[in-house]
């Protein structure tokens, strides 16, 4: 069996396939590593673009698993970051493996808004609740620089009625339509028997990245009556 002492100066292999995945602004770094006779440990460092005198900052040190949550090291999710990973076996270290540039807001996924639908007099009211990452609650784990431009600029709302689809846009900057909890959309209803099915997605500021699409919610109007 080969011991650590037998490893030459460049014989500690470099990690491979360093990738970053992010859901709800919670970025995690993954990498691959070949099977070694001795258990390797890994150090993960992060560098943020746009930070004055930006340096490589330790995110995970001497870990044995092949992933590292770097959410505490994201200053502004709109800005780019880079990650590098090195392996250590015994006293010897590998070269660094570097990730591609990654911006959490641009390259990550954001969960969907939640919808509620109801009939009020001669219209259907649609409540669009902002994705959980943007509102306070149990799911809010991420903290970031308040000057970020990572927020929802518009909602695309898709309304299907008896087979045909209409798309509405809600601008979140309009105070009449939106606050920091939800947006509202009112749709006039015809007196005919109709089923309305609604889904929505958010569009983020700057890059125009869309959130995941919400589940479709439906309501059936029978003349003046209602079934959910």
């Amino acid at each position: 069996e080969m011991g650590t002492a037998d490893l030459g100066p460049s014989s500690v292999p470099t990690p491979t396939n360093v990738t970053i995945e992010s859901y709800n602004m919670n970025p995690i770094v993954y990498w691959e590593y070949q099977i070694m006779p001795q258990v390797p440990v890994f150090t993960v460092e992060v560098k943020n673009y746009g930070v004055k005198n930006s340096e490589w900052i330790d995110a995970c040190i001497n870990i044995s698993h092949h992933y590292c949550n770097i959410s505490d090291h994201v200053g502004d999710p709109s800005n780019s970051l880079w990650v590098r990973v090195k392996a250590r076996v015994g006293q010897k270290e590998s070269a660094y493996a570097k990730s591609e540039e990654f911006a959490v807001c641009r390259d990550g996924k954001i969960g969907p808004p939640k919808l509620d639908i109801r009939k009020e007099e001669k219209q259907i009211m649609i409540d669009i609740f902002h994705p959980s990452v943007f509102v306070n609650g149990d799911e809010q784990e991420v903290d970031y620089d308040p000057e970020t431009t990572c927020y929802i600029r518009v909602y695309n709302v898709y309304v299907r009625m008896n087979g045909s689809e209409i798309q509405y846009k809600i601008l979140t900057q309009k105070e009449d339509d939106c606050d920091e909890i939800q947006c509202q959309l009112a749709i006039p209803v015809s007196s005919l028997n109709s089923q309305y099915c609604v889904s929505a997605e958010g569009v983020l500021h700057v890059w125009g990245v869309t959130t995941e699409k919400s589940k479709e919610v439906c309501i059936t109007i029978f003349n003046s009556s209602i079934k959910g």
């Epitope: 902002h130 306070n136 903290d143 970031y144 929802i152 979140t172 606050d179 920091e180 909890i181 500021h205």
Partner: nanobody
Framework: QVQLQQFGGGLVQAGGSLRLSCTAS??????????MGWYRQAPGKQRERVAS???????YYSDSVKGRFAISRDTARNTVYLQMNSLEPEETAVYYC???????????WGQGTLVTVSS
């Protein structure tokens, strides 16, 4: 609609201290949904961020005020404070309170308050 009402400011000698406060009101206002910040604008210069506090309570400072200024908030009173120590004459400016919506990025501003630091 969010309203921000600022208090404090005035004339202070170089090396002195001053505390600004900013009270937010509005039916939907909650610190959990807004980032709060203090900005300043000196004559003939651009408005710059001095300090901010995120919806979760993390604080951010410009390099020039680190160690001298402190931002804090009182959630019961919907009030954010800026404690300014060791003030310098070049920090004479109009100081503005800001609330930025966490989801929409919508900005609200206080009326501004003049801080004059004499040498």
């Amino acid at each position: 609609q969010v309203q921000l009402q600022q208090f404090g400011g005035g004339l202070v000698q170089a090396g002195g201290s001053l505390r600004l406060s900013c009270t937010a009101s509005g039916s939907t206002f909650s610190f959990s949904n807004y980032h709060m910040g203090w900005y300043r604008q000196a004559p003939g210069k651009q408005r710059e961020r001095v300090a901010s506090i995120s919806s979760r309570g993390s604080t951010y400072y410009s390099d020039s005020v680190k160690g001298r200024f402190a931002i804090s908030r009182d959630t019961a009173r919907n009030t954010v404070y800026l404690q300014m120590n060791s003030l310098e004459p070049e920090e004479t400016a109009v100081y503005y309170c800001n609330a930025r919506g966490r989801a929409t990025g919508r900005d609200y501003w206080g009326q501004g308050t003049l801080v004059t630091v004499s040498s």
